[in-house]
C-alpha cells in the first residue's frame, strides 16, 4: 500500500462530532460487531442492539477543505478505529480524548468518508488505496476491494 510519509506535513484539525450512534452494515447486510477487545467483525444480526454503535468526528485538513476526513469512535467509549496495513485487521485504540490535531503517523486514525447513494466508503488516510472492509470469516480489515466488501450502509437513530 501507499506509504504515508508524504502526508507528514498535512495537519488535520478536529471540527466536531457530526454523527452519533450509527450502525454500519456491509453490502451483505452484515452489521459490524465487537469480536473482542481489539478487533471488529461482521455478522448478520436479528437484533441490531448487538451491533457496534459508532460516532463520527470531522477533521479539516490544512491542505484541502473539499475532502471529508473523519475519525470513527465506538459510542460511549474512548475506543477509536485505527488502520494497520493491507489485509490486517483494524484495531481499536484507546485514547483519553478525541485528538484535537492529527498529523504524520497518527493519520492511521483518519479516513476519507465518501458517499454515493446509499453506499459509504471509508478510505484510510494513511493508506489511500485501502478501505475499511469486511471479509468472510475474518476481522474488519483494510482492503483494496473484492473479495472484501468495502461499501457500507449507515443506519441512524438506532439508539
Amino acid at each position: 500500500s501507499a506509504p504515508f510519509s508524504f502526508l507528514s506535513n498535512v495537519k488535520y484539525n478536529f471540527m466536531r462530532i457530526i454523527k452519533y450512534e450509527f450502525i454500519l452494515n456491509d453490502a451483505l447486510n452484515q452489521s459490524i460487531i465487537r469480536a473482542n477487545d481489539q478487533y471488529l467483525t461482521a455478522a448478520a444480526l436479528h437484533n441490531l442492539d448487538e451491533a457496534v454503535k459508532f460516532d463520527m468526528g470531522a477533521y479539516k485538513s490544512s491542505k484541502d477543505d473539499a475532502k471529508i476526513t473523519v475519525i470513527l469512535r465506538i459510542s460511549k467509549t474512548q475506543l477509536y478505529v485505527t488502520a494497520q496495513d493491507e489485509d490486517q485487521p483494524v484495531l481499536l485504540k484507546e485514547m483519553p480524548e478525541i485528538p484535537k490535531t492529527i498529523t504524520g503517523s497518527e493519520t492511521n486514525l483518519l479516513f476519507f468518508w465518501e458517499t454515493h447513494g446509499t453506499k459509504n466508503y471509508f478510505t484510510s488516510v494513511a493508506h489511500p488505496n485501502l478501505f475499511i472492509a469486511t471479509k468472510q470469516d475474518y476481522w474488519v480489515c483494510l482492503a483494496g476491494g473484492p473479495p472484501s466488501i468495502t461499501d457500507f450502509q449507515i443506519l441512524e437513530n438506532q439508539a
Epitope: L7, A66, K67, F112, W113, T115, H116
Partner: antibody
Framework: QVQLVQSGAEVKKPGSSVKVSCKAS????????ILWVRQAPGQGLQWLGG????????DHAQDFQDRLTITVDESMTTAYMELSSLRPEDTAIYYC???????????WGQGTLVTVSS | DIVMTQSPDSLAVSLGERATINCKSS????????????LAWYQQKPGQPPKLLIY???TRESGVPDRFSGSGSGTDFTLTISSLQAEDVAVYYC?????????FGGGTKVEIK
C-alpha cells in the same frame, strides 16, 4: 433511492427574488452535499452554489455570492435556493442535485424554469 | 477557478462506431492524499436533467451500459462510447469537483452520422 421534486415554473420581474424548493422523497439529505446548477436556454451547465448540511456549510460561486441563499429545512428533506436582484440574464432552468458528499450530482430534480421579464 | 475544456464541441459518429470525448482541466483534479480524480461525466438529453454516467473519472454509475467508459488522470480525461447506439444522442459534460467552485466543461454534442 432518493427522488428530487422541485417547485413549479416562475415568472419574475427584474429586481425581484425567486425561491425554488427541492424536496427529497425516499431519503434525506443528511449524508449528502446539495448542488444548485442552472442552464440558460441553449447553454451549458453552471454551478451556483451548494450546501453540506451535516457541516452546516454553504458554498457559493463568486458571481452569486451577494444574491444567493441556500438553506435546508430541519427535517433534512427539503432544500431551498433563493436568488435575489433578478435580471433577464437569470432566465434559466434551475436544477438541484445530490447523492454524494462530494459536489457531483447522482440524483437530479426535474428542473424549475425561472423567467425574468418586465 | 478550474477551467474545464471539452473537445470537440460536436461529434458525428456512425451507429456501432466508437465516440471519444476529451476533457482537459486547467489544473490537476487528482487528490494525492487518496489517489482519486475528482471528475464526473454526465449525459443530457433535450428537456431532461443531466444523468450521471461516470464519477471518480472511471467508476461507471450503476445501470449505465458498459459501452460507456471513463479514463485519464490529473488534467486529461476521456469519455468513450465503444459502440454508439441511437439512444446515445445527447450532450455530454465533464465536471470537476476537486475544488470549489465545481466547474463544468462546455459540453459535446454527439449525433449520428
Amino acid at each position: 433511492q432518493v427522488q428530487l421534486v422541485q417547485s413549479g415554473a416562475e415568472v419574475k420581474k427584474p429586481g425581484s427574488s425567486v425561491k425554488v424548493s427541492c424536496k427529497a422523497s425516499g431519503g434525506r439529505f443528511t449524508n449528502y452535499a446539495i448542488l444548485w446548477v442552472r442552464q440558460a436556454p441553449g447553454q451549458g451547465l453552471q454551478w451556483l452554489g451548494g450546501i453540506i448540511p451535516i457541516f452546516d456549510e454553504t458554498d457559493h460561486a463568486q458571481d452569486f455570492q451577494d444574491r444567493l441563499t441556500i438553506t435546508v429545512d430541519e427535517s433534512m428533506t427539503t432544500a431551498y435556493m433563493e436568488l435575489s436582484s433578478l435580471r433577464p440574464e437569470d432566465t434559466a432552468i434551475y436544477y438541484c442535485a445530490t447523492g454524494s458528499n462530494s459536489y457531483y450530482g447522482l440524483y437530479w430534480g426535474q428542473g424549475t424554469l425561472v423567467t425574468v421579464s418586465s | 477557478d478550474i477551467v474545464m475544456t471539452q473537445s470537440p464541441d460536436s461529434l458525428a459518429v456512425s451507429l456501432g462506431e466508437r465516440a471519444t470525448i476529451n476533457c482537459k482541466s486547467s489544473q490537476s483534479v487528482l487528490y494525492s492524499s487518496n489517489n482519486k480524480n475528482y471528475l464526473a461525466w454526465y449525459q443530457q438529453k433535450p428537456g431532461q436533467p443531466p444523468k450521471l454516467l461516470i464519477y471518480w473519472a472511471s467508476t461507471r454509475e450503476s445501470g449505465v451500459p458498459d459501452r460507456f467508459s471513463g479514463s485519464g488522470s490529473g488534467t486529461d480525461f476521456t469519455l468513450t462510447i465503444s459502440s454508439l447506439q441511437a439512444e446515445d444522442v445527447a450532450v455530454y459534460y465533464c465536471q470537476q469537483y476537486y475544488s470549489s467552485p465545481p466547474t463544468f466543461g462546455g459540453g459535446t454534442k454527439v449525433e449520428i452520422k
